[in-house]
Every structure is written in C-alpha cells, then in structure tokens.
C-alpha cells in the first residue's frame, strides 16, 4: 500500500493510493488531507483523532458507507469537508456537531433519501457553502433539514428524483447568495419559489422540464425580493410555459439578469405575455443571455413581435450558438436601449445582417459581436453596419473572409476591431485608421505595414511575421502581443522606437540567439518590465547548441562574439 505525500506546510495528498482504510500515522501537523478515489468504506472513531489542526478534509469518491458517530470529534478547526460521491445511505447529525469552524460541506452524490432523522446542521454557524442531494434517491426535503442555517453564500441541491417538498423548508435560511436547484420537473417549483423569494439573490435552475409549468399566485405578502439573477440551464420550455414563467417576474422586481443555457424550446416563439404588468415589471432587466438554445422547429420560428415591448429597456443581449440567421428589422428597431449584442456562433450572412441592421436599428449599440458566423465580405459587412451610429467595438473574428479590398467603410465611431481567425493573408487600408485596438491574431500574415495613427493595442500573435512591425506605423502604441510568430530577433533600437510601449508579449518565437541579441538581453535587466511573458517564453531556436535555452540564461560563445 502506498503512503501519503505531505509538503512542509502540512498539505497531504493521498488520492488514488488504493487505501482500504484511513492511513495510520496522521499527525497534528497536517493542515489538509485529501484521500479521494480510494476504497476506504469505513471511518472509525479513532481514525482522525490525531488531526486536531486539520482545516481541509477531502474524502470524495472513496466508497465510504459507514462513519462512526464521533469520527470527526477532534476536528474543531476543520473548515472544508468533502464527502461527495460516496456510498452513505444515511447521514448523522453527530458527525457535524463538533465541526463549528466548518465553512464548506459537500454531501452530494451519496445515496440517501433524506438528510437524516434530525437536523444535521444546527451547529454549523460559519457554513458558507453547502452541497446536498443526488440524482436517484434523494426524494424528500423537509422543514427540519436546514434548521440552524441562517446565511449561505452557496447552496446546491440536487433533487432530480424529488417526490415531496415540505412547504417552508427553505424559508428558514434568511440569506442565500446563490442557490442552484437541480429539479427534473416543475412540480414543486412554485412552493420552493415562494420560500426563497426573500432570501435568494441568484437562482439557478438546472435540468428542469418546465413544459408543464403553470403559474398560480404565490401565497406571499408584499415582498421585496433581493433576486438579481435568474438562470435556466438544461431546461425544457414551451411557448405556453414561457408565458407562465413570465408571470413570476411580478415577484422579483429587482431582477437585472436572465440566462438560458443549453435549453430546449419545444415551440415556435409564439409567446403571448398577455398581462400588461409583466411588461413594466421587466423594467430592471438589463442583461439577457441565451446560449445553445435548441429549437427543434427553428425554421418555423416566429418573428417575436409579441415580445418586442418586453425588451425595450434591455442593455445587453447574448444569443450564442442558437442557429440565429435573422434579427428582423422591426425587432432591432425596438431594442432602443441595447448597448451590447453578441450573436457568436450563429448563421448570420450579409444579406440578412442588412435587414437586421436596418435604418434605426439598435440605436444605442456600442458593441457588436458576430464571431463565427457565415460572413464572407469585409467590405459589405462594414457598409451594412454604417447605420450603427454609436458602434465603437466590432468583433467579426472566426468568419472566413474573402481577401480584403483596398478600401472599406465602417461606422465612424469604431475604435475596436477583432479580425482574429479570419484567414486573412494581407492587411490593407480597408482597416479603418480610427482604430485604437486591433486584433488580427491567428491569421496568415507575414507582414504588417499599415499606418494606424491612433492604435494603442495591437494583437498579432499566431501569425508568420519575421520581425516586429515598424514602430513608425503606430506612434501611440501601448500594447503589442506578437507571440507565436517567426520573429528571430529584436534590438534596443527596435524597442526604443516605440515611444509609448508599455507591454510587449513576444514569447514563443523562433529566436536566433546571436551575439547582438544575447548581449542586449544581458545588458537590459529592465526587459522584464516591458516583456510580460519574460523570461520563460523566450527560448533560443538556434544556434543548435543553445536550442531550448532561455534567452536570459543563454551565454554567447566568447570565441564567436569577439572575432
């Protein structure tokens, strides 16, 4: 049997050592003990007795099925306990009685049906993070379960086989910063929602089939809910259940962010937020994020005209990887407050983008992200976006563009342009001279000779440049990142010619460790201030005898350099 490995600070690693019991020889010097991925099965009352100063105990996936009642009695200093993914079919309050310093407790993934006969946590007054439940057997949440807990930073409950929720079970916790609920269906959602309304700031609902969700008024008095963010991950919705969910918003007037991640909409977007009060109550929602929305019948999807008014005050919208091919002109015109729009990984082409960015579209828009769509013409794209009078930042990276023409038109306020991973081989004057930030990384550029008088930041890593670009092209440059090119050298004169340069990242290039380069690096200890990735990323490519050496360590041959 292998033994533990401990470092000088008392951090001991015993992961995956085939232990069949808690190893002997534990001492008070131990601060952290990780015995995950073993076959321990049983923890006896004396097994951890010596670990009086232990602060972290991780026993994840160790097949534990029995823990003696007083097994943790000496662990008064323990702050972090992970018992997840074991075989504990019942939980005992006696385990946790002595753990008054505990801040983090993970009991998830054990096959218990309830949290025990009596309250488990009354003594855990310092607890900040609690993870409980499992996918298959945890079936009941009761009023006694959370007694003694008044405030938590994170509470995660995996109740994917929930059969019973006792009303007011979660109400005793007065403040929960982030509650994650894994529920397979919406059966108890309204009851739970009523109980957490006055305590939860961020509610995350996972893997919930909401297709049958139906709203009914909550049995709550006038409540000022602190909830700011609501996220649905892996959920299933229909047009009808979306309408029903909207009715919950009347109870969370401070909500500012809504997120749908990896959800399925079994519908056509035929939303009908019938109640006019819903519209006014969406007033504080500023951020809507949708990622990987699966709509089986996306080709029949409606124009969303029924929700135009809902979104008039929203400032930030992300709809990523969701087969978006058009934002109808009239919808764009209704998004009057929109400042940030991210449509990455969709199906946008110039023809439909023209309709989306019609006259009067997105009048407040400052940032537009169209990364990884199906745009082909840089010239057309720039022309189409001329309607966006306030646009300062455009990301059209990861589109495969035709060769760049000599001239293009762009929104006049544009200051940031991302053209990374677009396959460009040559940069031309199509790129606007107004830019302050330009990203052309991960392309096929072997030179860069474009004058950009206002450019402050240039990102040109992962190209084929053999030298640093000429400093006279960028009189006010502050930052240049030119990693992973074919740069073979740089000199005092080169670096000195960038009058304002504060940050240069030029590592992972093919440096020829000549006498000049090595003597320059030896004579210039201040390089570390400007080269942020110095010294580890600066390696000699040649001559052969110095290959792989750091420039900082490489020493030129006296013979070679003094001929």
């Amino acid at each position: 049997q292998e033994s533990l490995s401990c470092d000088a600070s008392g951090v001991c690693d015993g992961r995956s050592r085939s232990f069949t019991s808690i190893p002997s020889g534990l001492t008070a010097a131990m601060k952290s003990l990780d015995l995950s991925f073993n076959k321990i099965t049983y923890i006896g009352h004396g097994d951890l007795r010596a670990c009086a100063n232990l602060q972290v105990l991780i026993l994840k996936s160790s097949r534990i099925n029995t823990i003696e009642g007083d097994a943790f009695y000496s662990l008064g200093s323990l702050e972090h306990l992970d018992l997840s993914d074991n075989h504990l079919s019942s939980l005992s309050s006696s385990w946790f009685g002595p753990l008054s310093s505990l801040k983090y407790l993970n009991l998830m993934g054990n096959p218990y049906q309830t949290l025990g006969v009596t309250s488990l946590f009354p003594n855990l007054t310092n607890l900040q993070t609690l993870r409980i439940g499992n996918v298959e057997t945890f079936s009941e949440i009761r009023r006694i379960d959370f007694a003694g807990l008044t405030s938590l930073n994170e509470l995660e409950i995996k109740a994917l086989s929930l059969r019973n929720y006792q009303s007011q079970s979660l109400k005793s916790i007065r403040d929960i910063h982030h509650l994650t609920l894994h529920l397979s269906e919406s059966a108890f959602l309204l009851e739970i929602f009523a109980d957490i309304l006055s305590s939860v700031r961020y509610l995350e609902l996972r893997d919930t089939n909401l297709a049958r969700f139906q709203f009914s008024p909550l049995p709550v008095d006038e409540v000022s809910s602190p909830m700011k963010k609501l996220a649905f991950r892996g959920s299933v919705l229909t047009d009808e259940s979306f309408n029903e969910l909207l009715k919950l918003l009347r109870y969370i007037l401070e909500l500012s962010e809504v997120e749908f991640d990896d959800c399925t909409l079994n519908g056509l977007g035929d939303f009908n937020p019938s109640e006019s009060d819903v519209v006014s109550e969406l007033g504080k929602v500023e951020t809507v994020t949708i990622r990987r929305l699966h709509i089986p019948q996306f080709y029949l999807f409606y124009d969303l005209s029924t929700v135009y008014s809902l979104l008039e005050k929203v400032k930030r919208i992300t709809v990523e990887n969701s087969k978006v091919f058009l934002v109808p002109c009239s919808f764009s015109q209704h998004l009057k407050s929109l400042e940030f729009l991210d449509l990455s990984e969709n199906l946008m082409v110039e023809e439909y983008l023209k309709n989306s960015a019609c006259k009067g579209a997105w009048p407040s828009l400052q940032t537009l992200v169209l990364s990884q769509n199906h745009l082909r013409s840089m010239q057309k794209t720039g022309e189409i976006l001329l309607t966006l009078k306030n646009l300062t930042s455009l990301d059209i990276s990861r589109n495969t563009f035709h060769p760049m023409p000599d001239s293009c038109q762009w929104p006049e306020k544009m200051r940031f342009l991302n053209l990374s991973s677009t396959g460009i081989r040559v940069v031309k004057t199509c790129i606007p001279q107004t830019l302050e930030v330009l990203d052309v990384s991960n392309n096929n550029l072997d030179s860069f000779s474009l004058f950009l008088p206002r450019l402050q930041e240039l990102y040109i890593s992962r190209n084929k440049l053999k030298t640093l670009p000429d400093a006279s092209l960028f009189p006010v440059l502050l930052v240049m990142k030119i990693r992973e090119n074919a740069v073979s050298t740089f000199s005092k004169d080169q670096l000195g010619s960038f009058p304002k340069l504060e940050t240069l990242e030029a590592g992972d290039n093919h440096f020829v460790c000549s006498c000049e380069l090595l003597s320059f690096t030896m004579e210039t200890p201040a390089l570390a201030q400007i080269l942020v990735d110095w010294p580890d990323s600066y390696l000699c490519d040649s001559p052969p005898r110095l290959h792989g050496h750091r420039l900082q360590d490489a020493r030129p041959s006296v013979l070679e350099c003094h001929q």
């Epitope: 499992n134 996918v135 298959e136 057997t137 994917l160 086989s161 397979s184 269906e185 996972r206 893997d207 919930t208 089939n209 297709a211 991950r233 892996g234 299933v236 990896d262 399925t264 079994n266 990987r292 699966h294 089986p296």
Partner: nanobody
Framework: EVQLVESGGGLVQAGGSLRLSCAAS??????????FAWVRQAPGREREFVSV????????DYASSVKGRFTISRDNAKNTVYLQMTSLEPEDTAVYYC???????????????WGQGTPVTVSS
C-alpha cells in the same frame, strides 16, 4: 413504435472494460429531444439507476457506485447513447437497460421508452 436496442454486453474479467451502445431505431423519434439513462438489474434485485445524460450531452450524472468508472455519452447524429464501463467489478454484473424520457432524473419510473437489455457478467 420507437425501439431502443442495446448492444455491447458480454463476459469480462474483473478490472476489464466494456462499451455498451443504445440505438434508437425509429426515424421519426426526436432523438435529441430526450434524456437517456442506463439502468441495471442484477438477478433477484430491484432495478438500479446507473447514469443519465441530457438532450445535448451537456449534463451527465452517475450513481455513486459507478462514478469515476463509467462514462455516459451520446452521438445525436447517430441516434446512439453509449456507456463506457472501466474497472469492472463482480458487483456490476446485471442486465443493463437503456431508457429514454422527457425528464432528467434517476427515477426509473419516469422513463417512457425502454430497451430489451444487454447482459453484463463480470467474473472474478
């Protein structure tokens, strides 16, 4: 009629590996609209949940008895769900069933469609 057909079971020595497959045969079946689970039944025992994967493959869960040894995955283009089983133990001997349903859960009774099962025998 939707048919789920399991394959890949067999006899293996303790410590060995197997990969089970579950293919959905009905073309009209909206494969990526369903969650899939693997459930096993040992002789004389009740059905026991093993693992579940959601529609997109973005969420997976496991019974504590198999976590770290088994991996569930799906290929929506091939209408197939897989269960990669490693470090097999005699206690894993059972008939393994594939099940599909609208709910992401470890409760076997919430699944609408079931396969016929594929037997796995782990000898010591």
């Amino acid at each position: 009629e939707v048919q789920l057909v399991e394959s890949g079971g067999g006899l293996v020595q303790a410590g060995g590996s197997l990969r089970l497959s579950c293919a959905a045969s009905e073309l009209a079946f909206d494969f990526d609209g369903y969650n899939f689970a693997w459930v096993r039944q040992a002789p004389g025992r009740e059905r026991e949940f093993v693992s579940v994967i959601n529609r997109s493959g973005g969420s997976t869960d496991y019974a504590s008895s198999v976590k770290g040894r088994f991996t569930i995955s799906r290929d929506n283009a091939k209408n197939t769900v897989y269960l990669q089983m490693t470090s097999l133990e005699p206690e894993d001997t059972a008939v393994y069933y594939c099940a599909a349903g609208p709910y992401y859960t470890g409760s076997s009774d919430r699944y609408d469609y079931w396969g016929q099962g594929t037997p796995v025998t782990v000898s010591s």
